[in-house]
């Protein structure tokens, strides 16, 4: 058992032209976090199961806001290591995927939005207990600098964390046949329980008597490198010492295939058979397939198993992005009509409609006047999700049921007195004024300024408003 540790040193624009835009802005401040996924190197089983060695998520980094006009600098990083504990032997060869995620901290409804900024992948050979290994990986215009190591958890030691150490029974030396445990010199190696002769460097066991080989080693005692040439090689002079044909130089010598690819000669040159997740002439290009589990938030992955295969993620409602990594604020599209209130419930959208409207998007204007009668000869007028009555003369109120006081609004001008009448109102004008509302002054010479009084009606007499 042990722990794989990853230290991110920097994440920022890579060298060369085409510097990426800062992922954060004054309007949308954000912070970064990282995800690491580990798989054992050449294991077929592990290639199918995502992150079979383990995975880890970093803490969130400090909030970052872009300075307008400034180029994107290295972005502020989360504190601490990413640690991936492993329970069994350290495999020696492993694949990694490191993802850089952005958490947007704007005023998103429903919480922050996450989006994948960059993803790097690779395959490495690494002995447990060794020093930190430094690496630089590029993803598009971004560059990620990091270090990693694998360390054993006591009592395990060794390059695969398979040898066990115990405190010394005697103060001065270890028991017969047992070595001190480097670097824990005050402890001794526990008695071996593996098959006798099993290589302590390249083999390990989980049960007494067995000898299981690390990646790249074979044979009953894990002492034979997988790449050892066969004595049946068709080229080269015979070796006097071994009787084997020693291979001459060939296109596969030195193995031009990267990332654990295996080389085979062709009539003209060589061909690399790449492990899952890598492709290219020399297996130098790393690819992501559905086997890597790239779809988030319940997205379904569509694609083939070959490293060259594309993939797409079929996203559930409420998520978008090439990996379904971004939450959609579906209410920002203002789907509710007629002033309805939008509610994003995650699994569905709901519109809460104003009075007088209905339908999934409040698109139906209800017939406000249906079944509503206006009393006393009033007529119903629709509008704005509510009905109102236009009342006949002498009536008022919501349904025209109330008798109106026509004098309440003081309709008679210039001090005229108002009288309610069955057909409306009558104004008794003050001296010097005339008209239905006492609105016209009577001129001193006796001639009215405006319409002449009808015959038989003297100025000053009450005038009925008809």
């Amino acid at each position: 058992a042990g722990v794989f540790e990853l230290q991110i040193h920097s994440f920022g624009p890579g060298p060369g032209p085409g510097a990426p835009r800062s992922p954060c802005s004054a309007r949308l401040p954000c912070r970064l976090f990282f995800r690491v996924c580990l798989k054992p190197g050449l294991s077929e089983e592990a290639a199918e199961s995502p992150c079979a060695l383990g995975a880890a998520l970093s803490a969130r980094g400090p909030v970052y806001t872009e300075q307008p006009g400034a180029p994107a600098p290295d972005l502020p990083l989360p504190d601490g290591l990413l640690q991936v504990p492993f329970r069994d032997a350290w495999p020696g060869t492993f694949s990694f995927i490191i993802e850089t995620w952005r958490e947007e901290l704007g005023d998103q409804i429903g919480g922050p939005a996450w989006s994948l900024l960059a993803r790097v992948a690779g395959r490495r050979r690494l002995a447990a207990g060794g020093p930190w290994a430094r690496d630089i990986q590029r993803a598009g215009a971004w560059e990620l600098r990091f270090s990693y190591r694998a360390r054993c958890e006591p009592p395990a030691v060794g390059t695969a964390c398979t040898r066990l150490c115990r405190p010394r029974s005697a103060p001065s030396r270890c028991g017969p046949g047992l070595r001190p445990c480097a670097p824990l010199e005050d402890e001794c190696e526990a008695p071996l329980v593996c098959r006798a002769g099993c290589s302590p460097e390249h083999g390990f066991c989980e049960q007494p008597g067995e000898c299981r080989c690390l990646e790249g080693w074979t044979g009953p005692l894990c002492t034979v490198p997988v790449s050892t040439s066969s004595c049946l090689s068709p080229r080269g002079p015979s070796s006097a010492t071994t009787g084997c044909l020693v291979p001459g130089p060939g296109p596969c010598d030195g193995n031009p295939c990267a990332n654990g690819g295996s080389c085979s000669e062709t009539p003209r040159s060589f061909e690399c058979t790449c492990p899952r997740g890598f492709y290219g002439l020399r297996c130098e290009v790393s690819g992501v397939t559905c086997a890597d589990g790239p779809c988030f938030n319940g997205g379904l992955c569509v694609g083939g198993a070959d490293p060259d295969s594309a993939y797409i993620c079929h996203c559930p409602p409420g998520f978008q992005g090439s990996n379904c990594e971004k939450r959609v604020d579906r209410c920002s599209l203002q789907p509710c009509r007629n002033g309805g209130l939008c509610l994003d419930l995650g699994h569905a959208l709901r519109c809460r409609c104003r009075a007088g409207f209905a339908g999934p998007r409040c698109e139906h204007d209800l017939d406000d006047c249906a079944g509503r009668a206006c009393a006393n000869g009033g007529t119903c007028v629709e509008g704005g999700g509510a009905h109102r009555c236009s009342c006949a003369l002498g009536f008022g109120g919501r349904d025209c049921r109330e008798r109106a006081d026509p004098c309440a609004a003081r309709p008679c001008a210039h001090g005229g007195r108002c009288y309610a009448h069955f057909s409306g109102l009558v104004c008794a004008c003050a001296p010097g004024y005339m008209g239905a509302r006492c609105e016209f002054p009577v001129h001193p010479d006796g001639a009215s300024a405006l319409p002449a009084a009808p015959p038989g009606l003297r100025p000053g007499d009450p005038q009925r408003y008809l």
Partner: nanobody, 115 residues
Framework: EVQLVESGGGEVQPGGSLRLSCGPS????????VGWFRQAPGKQRNLVAG???????NYAQSVKGRFTISRDNAKNTLYLQMSSLRAEDTAVYYC?????????WGQGTLVTVKP
């Protein structure tokens, strides 16, 4: 049962172009993820190009810059424009669509690239 029907396959010389069509079909709607798979003799079936239900497009590394996938939701049709064709592009090309419940496949159309 509703089927997807491909057309546009055939024989072409290296460097040539072809345009594959799939549909029209009521299956090809904007709420579905759609794509083109291909299968060469003795090989696995792999996604060449796809468009997800949220509009993200992706291509196999070997066809990037040469193939273009597009969909016409009004015509319920999916297209694959293939140019600069190579011998290794020879395969049966299958139209594909899916929603959360179902997957739909076409019968395939053969594309042969040879001098």
């Amino acid at each position: 049962e509703v089927q997807l029907v491909e057309s546009g396959g055939g024989e072409v010389q290296p460097g040539g172009s072809l345009r594959l069509s799939c549909g029209p079909s009521e299956i090809i709607t904007s709420d579905k993820s759609v794509g083109w798979f291909r299968q060469a003799p003795g090989k696995q079936r792999n996604l060449v190009a796809g468009i997800s239900n949220v509009g993200s497009t992706n291509y196999a590394q070997s066809v990037k810059g040469r193939f273009t996938i597009s969909r016409d939701n009004a015509k319920n049709t999916l297209y694959l424009q293939m140019s600069s064709l190579r011998a290794e592009d020879t395969a049966v090309y299958y139209c594909y669509a899916r929603d959360f419940e179902n997957e739909y496949w076409g019968q395939g159309t053969l594309v042969t690239v040879k001098p």
